[in-house]
Structures are given as C-alpha cells and as structure tokens.
C-alpha cells in the first residue's frame, strides 16, 4: 500500500515444496523500470535496486528483501537470509549492528560487558571491542612532581604514581593531591570517573561506492559506549581507475576527479560542490586504503523539502601495500595505554 | 480501526511549557510518519510539525521552529509534542494525524492549548 | 511555502444543488513520480476533519459518490453533485508534494 514505509508493498509468494531448494529470480534483463521513480515516505531513502535497474525505495528494519528489493543501506541494514534457508532467497533486513564479538577465543555477544582483566573493562558493540580503563589514577601533579613513578601497589591491581624527586616534600601517591593537579587545569577530560574512549572508525562497508564507517565512542552523558556512523565512500564504481594508472606504474594510490560535483545521498543533493581524493587501485596485489583522513558535515537539500547533514569520510591521502588485513582492530589504538599487553594476549 | 487519541491540552501563561501526547492504535505505529496539526479557534488548519516513521527525520513550520520539539516512543505507540516558551497566539486545538505519503489519512479528536495570562 | 488559496470562502447551497470548490496552489504539484498530491479534507462543526479525496481525485472509502475531484498542475475543483443537509462544514484543499504540507483557508458551506 502506498503508506507503509515501502510504498510498493512486496508479496513473496513461497515457492511449491518440491522446488524449495530453487532460488526464484528476482532480477530481470534487460530492465524493466516504471516511468517514474517511486515517491519513498518520510526518512526512507531512494535507491538502485539490487540489479542495479530501477529507483525503489528502501525496505527498512523488519522488511522482507530480495536481491532485487534490498535493505536501506544508508541505516546500516543487511538481508539477513538465515531464515530461508536453503534457498536463501527471501531475507529481513537486519541491522548491521548487533553482532557478537570474539575476543582471545572467547566469545561475547553483543552488548555483553566483561572484564579481560582488573584493569579493563570492555563491552561488545556490533563486533567491536571497546574497553575503557578501570586504573584511573590521574598523570602526576605537574606542579611539583619532576620524577614521577609508577610503582605497582601489593596487593592492589592498579599502579599508584609516586614522587620522590622533590626532598621537601614526602613520598605520597599522586592520588593524595589530585586537588595541586586539578588547579593546574590539567585534568583528563571525565565523566564520572569515566576516560574518555573513541575507537577508530570502522573499515568503509563497500570497496566501492556509499558504504558506511563506524566507531564506538563513550563520550557522552552517560559513558556508555554507543555507535557512532559516518558515510564513506572509498572509490567510485563507475570509474575504472586502472586506467588512470600512469604508464611503467603498477599503483595510482589517490584518484580525484577532474570536476567539482555534488554528493547525492536517498535523491537529496549536497548544498555545495566537493572535489573528492578516492583511494586507486593496483595491478597487482595490493590494496589501497586511506591512511590520511577526517570526518566531514555535509550538508543535503532535498527537492521536495528541508535538508539534512550527514557526517562523512574525507581523504586526504592514500597508500598502497600488501597488508590487506581488515583494519577494524579497536586494539592497536590501546596500545597507547599502560600494560596493553595484559589485555591484548 | 485505527485510533489517535490525544491528552495533554490545557491552559498555560506565555512563556511556560506544555507536553502534549498522541497514543495510536489499530495500526502499526512504528511504521508511519506522524504529524501535528492545529486550528486556532474559528480559524483554518496550520500544519504543524512532523517526525519521520522511526524519528530520524523532523520537519517543522517557521512559526513553531526552536520552540517546538516533535518525538515518538514507537514502543509505546505514542507521538509527543513539546510545546517551550508558549505564545498567546500558539492557542489553538492540535490535532495529531497520520501520514499517508503525500497525505493525512487518520486525524485524532484534538486538545485544546490556550495560552492566557 | 506553497500557497493554496481556496474560493469561495462561504459558499451557500440549497440542497440537492451542486457545489463546486476552486482551489489554486503557487507552484506546481507534480510530485517526481508523477503524482499530483492534492487532498480535500472536510471539517463538521465540533470535528476533526477528514479525508475526502487524495491524489486530486481518489475518493476515500465511506466517502458518498456525490463527492469528486479533479484538475492539474496548479487549479484543483472539489464538486459535489447533490449536497446535502450533512455536508454542512468546512472543506479544505491541501498540498503534499512539497514540504511543509500546506492548507487552503478554508470554504464554508452552509445550506440556504
């Protein structure tokens, strides 16, 4: 019906038992598209379909989806198709998010909070990891302390920072004057006895095309780690850029077009023009991947009514290496904290 | 059948803040953009505010826009509207109604929000 | 914003007379795919309003077939090929192409 989120309801009629096992095709060449692109209700975005054929409107969180009728990938939601099988022809979609984690061999579902060990506490969020410390003990007065130690406490799980560099005054823990460290507006952002922790963003979902990036922050009221998205796009799919690649090269590591143009986003344009880096591609091997980035607002306008703003990927530079590990590894950013070791092995 | 059944009006000094609330049923409320409407008395109908079918988009009229907050608990079938720094001229009857893409199908009985000192 | 300006504003009718509608909107109501999202609405005194006609001249279920709608791109009519006693009220045009939704003023209809 024309008021549900998908305007053109999809009745899936399931097979006959005998042909369970056969998948029905969903796409059909050459395309067959209506003359007008559908109008898609509020907060739905308009997009090709799977066949990549015709303008349709996205099924959202709890649609069925086909390969031809595919979930909106704008919120992050995937054709879950567990429940079909074998055919695997008719799925829901499903968000992205709600996946388990792994960690050291043990598995952790998602939301699921645990401590690897007395010094951290990590909670599963849509297969990430993100952990925050439970050591808070502040850095060491600046204001007198010159030498400062951190000494391990018998006894207790977490280090204690000592000073003893300054004769006129006695040995004592950081902890005791956190009131000298204060004044000197030194103070580590907090919430609560809470560290501030932002995991990296997330590898773009597509090689190609919109994709979206995520990350796992707890900067907010609560600390709570929450998901945080931005959209992405690595290199556009229409472009072969092997064929930017110069001559005797094997690699072009940045393609960037020669126009300025508008990004699109579900039919809505970007108020102003951008002339995007994409990261290229190789002949060989390697992969490219950006390694010179940050997160930019982009603002939309719609033609039928106000716009919107959507955080999204900027490259500044790429690199091409063999290393095509997938980088969605929250724990090379720990490495920076005291004793990673214990948490990472 | 479906239902939209509002509660929340009543009379207020300009300046203060008023909640109102739209409990929906006979339908899947989580999958339908919802929105307000009003009709100062003896006057015609001012459409209002509306919020997408899980809230992640709003639109709202130029009279109402930084005072006006529209929002909805889709599990609890409800649709709210907060009404801050409340003017004389916000009195009105509002009615919450259901969109219909391109249309409103479904409009509630109305609560009155007179705004007096 | 998109304007729509309704006439007559009052609009006397004998019963079993016809009555017409003009509603005129400042920009064009083609929707990009294809269609025109106008709507008529009437409003009984001391009641919500409802849904008449959509998509400029679809008529709701339970609406009486006296009821019709019709025009394009800018100039829309509501007709009514009988009225009767019970139509007494206000009818409203409104657009749902662009946003906001906009409302005509309002036409009342009264029985002579």
């Known amino acids: 019906t024309a008021l549900s989120p998908t305007p053109t309801t999809m009745t899936f009629t399931p097979a006959p038992l005998e042909e369970t096992t056969t998948r029905p095709e969903f796409c059909k060449w050459p395309c067959e598209c209506p003359q007008s692109p559908p109008r898609c209700p509020l907060g739905v975005s308009l997009i090709t379909d799977g066949c990549e054929c015709c303008k349709i409107c996205a099924q959202q969180l709890g649609d069925n989806c086909t390969e031809a009728a595919i979930c909106d990938p704008h919120r992050g939601l995937y054709c879950d198709y567990s429940g079909d099988r074998p055919r695997y022809a008719i799925g829901v979609c499903a968000q992205v998010v709600g996946v388990g984690c792994v960690l050291d061999g043990v598995r952790y579902t998602n939301g699921e909070s645990f401590q690897p060990n007395c010094r951290y506490n990590c909670t599963c969020i849509d297969g990430t990891v993100g952990c925050t410390p439970l050591c808070l003990s502040p850095r060491p007065p600046r204001l007198w302390c010159r030498q400062p130690r951190h000494v391990r406490v018998p006894g207790q799980c977490c280090e204690q920072w000592v000073c003893d560099d300054d004769a006129r005054r006695p040995r004592q823990t950081a902890l005791l004057d956190t009131r000298a460290f204060a004044a000197s507006g030194a103070v580590e952002q907090r919430y609560e006895n809470c560290i501030a922790y932002t995991s990296p963003w997330s590898p773009c979902s597509t090689t190609c095309g919109l994709g979206i990036s995520t990350r796992i922050s707890n900067v907010n009221a609560r600390c709570w780690p929450e998901q945080e998205s931005r959209l992405c796009n690595l290199r556009p799919c229409d472009v072969d850029i092997q064929l930017h690649i110069k001559a005797g090269k094997k690699c072009l590591a940045v393609y960037q077009p020669e126009e300025a143009t508008n990004f699109t986003l579900a039919g809505c344009v970007s108020t102003r023009t951008y002339r995007p880096k994409y990261c290229g591609v190789c002949t060989d091997n390697r992969c490219c991947i950006p390694y010179k980035s940050k997160t930019i607002s982009v603002d939309f306008q719609c033609p039928e009514g106000p716009g919107f703003s959507r955080q999204v990927l900027w490259i500044n530079a790429c690199f091409c290496n063999l290393s095509c590990r997938n980088p969605n590894d929250i724990f090379a950013d720990l490495e920076s904290y005291p004793d990673f070791e214990e948490i990472a092995n | 059948q479906v239902q939209l059944v509002e509660s929340g009006g009543g009379v207020v000094q300009p300046g203060r803040s008023l909640r109102l609330s739209c409990g929906a049923s006979g339908f899947t409320f989580s999958r339908f953009a919802m929105h307000w409407v009003r009709q100062a008395p003896g006057k015609g109908l001012e459409w209002v505010t509306v919020t997408s079918f899980d809230g992640s988009e709003i639109y709202y009229a130029d009279s109402v826009k930084g005072r006006f907050t529209i929002s909805r608990d889709n599990s609890k079938n409800t649709l709210y509207l907060q009404m801050n720094s409340l003017r004389v001229d916000d009195t009105a009857v509002y009615f919450c109604?259901?969109?219909?893409?391109?249309?409103?199908?479904?409009w509630g009985q109305g609560t009155l929000v007179t705004v007096s000192s | 914003d998109v304007v729509m300006t309704q006439s007559p504003l009052s609009l006397p009718v004998t019963i079993g007379q016809p009555a017409s509608i003009s509603c005129r909107s400042s920009?064009?109501?083609?929707?990009?795919?294809?269609?025109?999202?106008l709507n008529w609405f009437q409003q009984r005194p001391g009641q919500s309003p409802r849904r008449l006609i959509y998509k400029v001249s679809n008529r709701d279920s339970g609406v009486p077939d006296r009821f019709s709608g019709s025009g394009s791109g800018t100039d829309f009519t509501l007709k009514i090929s009988r009225v009767e006693a019970e139509d007494v009220g206000v009818y409203y045009c409104m657009q749902g192409t662009h946003w906001p939704y906009t409302f005509g003023q309002g036409t009342k209809l009264e029985i002579k």
């Open positions: 109604a259901r969109d219909a893409l391109g249309s409103i199908d479904y």
């Open positions: 920009q064009g109501l083609v929707y990009s795919d294809g269609n025109t999202y």
